[in-house]
């Protein structure tokens, strides 16, 4: 299953499959997730070790048992790959690292005014993988405001150095934010020239393209089909690059297929997994396990659930079957691709779905009336769980925010439905940033069911929580995916990095905003919050957030939207924007419904499939 917990001051002993330099544990975890063999990782921050060569070291590890012995190491951070973690799987990494220089091949230098501009340049450059920016206070005047675009053979820095007034980060191409755009075309009977960066076996050109997309240095590819004249080169997928970023030449060639990486696509990237099943094909590799199962789909599920399994073959040979069940061969290799592909067999083969973002249909959990005042504009994909709840009567308008928590589920505030309980009037927009982008052709979700907490009463602040079941499930993308819910009764976690988002008023007597706003707000203890509200009871089912001096807060139109906190590199939905005394008033924190206190209710309502246990929409 999905294991998200991090282990502080711990280092996994043995099992090394790769090592690299990464700026933090979260990036190390992401590299582990995308490495075909990595199940566990250990990271050494600069503060944890004196050996300069091992600082920022990220060690990727494998283990037959799925675990390794942990040894105490002060400052070290260890954890698990996020394979099998559904929508949490993403190669997108937005963080900017201050005081850190990520080294690599510097291939472009320009003057820019901010680190954000530098990151944008990197994202819009086909070869740039990461960058460093010298701030205006950098000690050498001639380097100030320099933006260095970089790459390396492995896509990660060749070294990372602590350096004042330097800021570094990664390209946002994996966030589907590149302005370059991509070539979706597949070119039949055409071979590209240039430098081969890797060679793998794939059953078709589409798998080859997805592998190219997620390979750090692949810009385009050529695939040799299973009828290619040279037998030893059949099903070979050649991942390629060039100085210019495009093929310098192409040759007409029977039984070859060529195409481009889709990493520069804007708004949609392919999933980092291959779901197709190939009948009459055997995939060869190292045997992990053999099990009897009923049908090829069950074989794929079995492979997906066994975290080390990379691909499988389901044999229909009479000697491999008994009754309705046949042998399911679970396999792996060094690079995650079959070591041999055979056609015309009595088997069916395919890949593990452990890296698919879709995950299962349930809500996301983890093991462990009120624009934003004083906020700033959000950027694409920054808050992919944020939805806009809009009402269409004569005109259409934004009324509330909400949070996507599953393919078919949105969590919001109950008071959003005060006086508007009819599901037909509501339209739910997801994966949007600007309300002005919504036209009559913009797709929206309709409501199948509104489930208001049974103890909620109109015009009262208690139990201000509601679930919306959508008529049709949503697909996950970099711009539309769920937020994880906290653990039940999560009281021990101290959240220090919390944000509220929404399109609500920018002042008490204001208007709905066009661009999704964000504001960083500290949590306030319930005891402190209670003292600020002389005539309202702040219960343990509420959480408060705000600045003593005011100035930053949620406001009208933000209701129902998320209060999210980042902990151990993972965002969690801590609160639902509920109520407050005015907006951003001095000494008056905003009050949010505490999601952890409603976990039983959320899980009960989202998991009761027959609907009998679900509360009906209010009449």
């Amino acid at each position: 299953g999905c294991l998200t917990q991090l282990y502080e001051n711990a280092f996994f002993r043995g099992g090394d499959v790769a090592s690299m330099y990464t700026p933090n544990a979260q990036y190390c975890q992401m590299r582990c997730t995308f490495h075909p063999r990595c199940l566990l990782f250990s990271f050494l921050p600069a503060s944890s070790i004196n050996d300069m060569e091992k600082r920022f070291g990220c060690f990727l590890k494998d283990s037959v048992t799925g675990t390794l012995p942990k040894v105490h190491r002060t400052g070290a951070v260890s954890g698990h790959s996020l394979k099998q973690c559904g929508h949490q799987i993403s190669a997108c990494h937005r963080d900017i690292y201050k005081g850190v220089d990520m080294r690599g091949v510097n291939f472009n230098v320009s003057k820019v005014s901010s680190v954000e501009e530098c990151q944008k340049r990197c994202t819009s450059n086909i070869r740039c993988q990461f960058f460093s920016y010298a701030t205006q206070t950098f000690h050498k005047a001639e380097y100030r405001n320099n933006c260095l675009l970089k790459y390396s053979p492995g896509g990660t820095p060749t070294a990372i150095k602590v350096l004042s007034n330097v800021e570094s980060g990664f390209s946002l191409k994996p966030c589907a934010l590149s302005e370059i755009g991509c070539h979706m075309n597949i070119f039949q009977h055409l071979a590209f020239s240039d430098v081969d960066v890797a060679r793998v076996l794939t059953p078709d050109a589409f798998v080859c393209r997805t592998i190219c997309t997620y390979h750090p240095n692949c810009l385009f590819f050529t695939f040799y089909t299973n009828v290619w004249k040279i037998e030893s080169q059949r099903n070979v997928c050649l991942l390629k690059t060039s100085e210019s970023g495009t093929p310098s030449s192409s040759t007409p060639q029977e039984n070859t297929i060529s195409g481009y990486s889709l990493l520069t696509c804007k708004r949609t990237l392919p999933e980092p997994c291959h779901s197709k099943i190939y009948p009459g094909v055997d995939f060869g590799g190292e045997e992990l396990n053999v099990t009897f199962v009923k049908g090829v789909n069950v074989c794929q599920e079995t492979c997906t659930k066994m975290i080390r399994c990379q691909f499988f073959t389901y044999s229909l040979l009479p000697e491999d079957c008994k009754e309705e069940k046949c042998k399911c061969f679970l396999r792996l290799s060094m690079d995650g691709s079959p070591t041999r592909i055979a056609y015309g067999t009595q088997g069916s083969s395919g890949y593990s779905l452990r890296l698919c973002n879709t995950g299962d249909n349930s809500v996301c959990t983890t093991k462990t009336s009120t624009r934003i005042v004083g906020g700033t504009n959000s950027s694409w994909g920054e808050w992919p769980w944020q939805v806009s709840l809009q009402v269409k009567l004569t005109a259409q308008r934004h009324l509330c925010g909400g949070s996507l928590i599953g393919h078919q589920w949105v969590l919001t505030a109950a008071h959003c439905f005060d006086g508007l309980p009819l599901q037909d009037v509501w339209r739910i927009y997801s994966g949007i940033l600007n309300l002005s982008d919504i036209t009559k052709d913009t797709p929206f979700s309709q409501i199948k069911e509104i489930i208001i907490h049974q103890n909620y009463k109109v015009s009262e602040g208690n139990h201000d929580i509601a679930l919306i079941k959508l008529q049709a499930p949503l697909n996950y993308t970099e711009f539309q995916k769920p937020i994880c819910l906290p653990s039940k009764g999560d009281t021990s976690t101290i959240y220090t990095n919390c944000w509220v988002t929404g399109w609500g008023f920018s002042k008490e007597k204001g208007e709905i905003q066009n661009i999704l706003q964000k504001v960083n707000i500290p949590l306030v203890t319930n005891e402190e919050c209670q003292k600020r509200y002389q005539d309202y009871k702040i219960t343990q089912r509420m959480v408060c957030a705000g600045y003593k001096e005011g100035g930053k807060d949620a406001c009208k139109g933000d209701s129902g939207g998320p209060l999210v906190c980042k902990h151990n590199g993972m965002w969690r939905l801590v609160g639902i924007t509920s109520w407050g005394e005015g907006c951003a008033r001095r000494e008056q924190p905003g009050v949010y419904t505490k999601v952890a206190e409603y976990m039983d209710w959320i899980l009960e309502k989202t998991q009761s499939s027959d609907g009998k246990a679900q509360m009906q929409s209010p009449a």
Partner: antibody
Framework: EVQLQQSGAEVVRPGASVKLSCKPS????????MFWLRQRPDQGLEWIGR????????VYDPRFQDRASITAVTSSNTAFLQVNSLTSEDTAVYYC?????????WGQGTLVTVSA | DIQMTQSPSSLSASLGDKITITCKAS??????IAWYQHKPGKGPRLLIH???SLHQDIPSRFSGSGSGRDYSFSISNLEPEDFAIYYC????????FGGGTKVEIK
């Protein structure tokens, strides 16, 4: 409109107990804290204790900890104060009040006279 | 326990006057002070909370200020209905009332 209706005046003997009630209208007691306070003749206001009717949690002024008991029945939307071992010093007007952090709406008071 | 010393215990004033009442806490109460008006036969009425915030529907002639241990409450332009007893209440640590100030017509 928020109102808190308190029970009628009581005359009780020293050493006896008294149980006062407070029935609000216009709100649900479980959505607020309920306070009990008192004012002795020609004296200031004193805080006796507070209850969270939703869960029954109480906080008392240490001076009343052993003799006072605050309860609430959410089904009848009523809060109660019982004071035991009464002496003449307990002669006072007893108030219930709705509160968040502080009492914000008060009842009209119940006069309790302790007299032999 | 936090003690609240309220002064004066009584004062006489005329209609239209401005009066000020003070409360001194035995320790810093972080601005968590409220002021109440009490008239005979009625329950007290909340006027001000958190030092200077007017409770709903309270006229602006009532005001409060202070910090640390020292706080004051004022009524400007006294009106007939303002003659009553006034109490301060600290709520930084549990709840303690001041002794009260009786405001009478001169």
């Amino acid at each position: 409109e928020v109102q808190l209706q308190q029970s009628g005046a009581e005359v009780v003997r020293p050493g006896a107990s008294v149980k006062l009630s407070c029935k609000p209208s216009g709100f649900n007691i479980k959505d607020y804290y309920m306070f009990w306070l008192r004012q002795r003749p020609d004296q200031g206001l004193e805080w006796i204790g507070r209850i969270d009717p939703e869960n029954g949690n109480t906080v008392y002024d240490p001076r009343f900890q052993d003799r006072a008991s605050i309860t609430a029945v959410t089904s009848s939307n009523t809060a109660f104060l019982q004071v035991n071992s009464l002496t003449s010093e307990d002669t006072a007007v007893y108030y219930c009040a709705r509160a968040g952090s502080i009492p914000s709406y008060w009842g009209q008071g119940t006069l309790v006279t302790v007299s032999a | 326990d936090i003690q609240m010393t309220q002064s004066p215990s009584s004062l006489s004033a005329s209609l239209g006057d401005k009066i000020t009442i003070t409360c001194k806490a035995s320790q810093d109460i972080n601005k968590y002070i409220a002021w109440y008006q009490h008239k005979p036969g009625k329950g007290p009425r909340l006027l001000i909370h958190y030092t200077s915030s007017l409770h709903q529907d309270i006229p602006s002639r009532f005001s409060g200020s202070g910090s640390g241990r020292d706080y004051s409450f004022s009524i400007s332009n006294l009106e007939p209905e303002d003659f009553a007893i006034y109490y301060c209440l600290q709520y930084d640590d549990l709840w303690t009332f001041g002794g009260g100030t009786k405001v009478e017509i001169k």
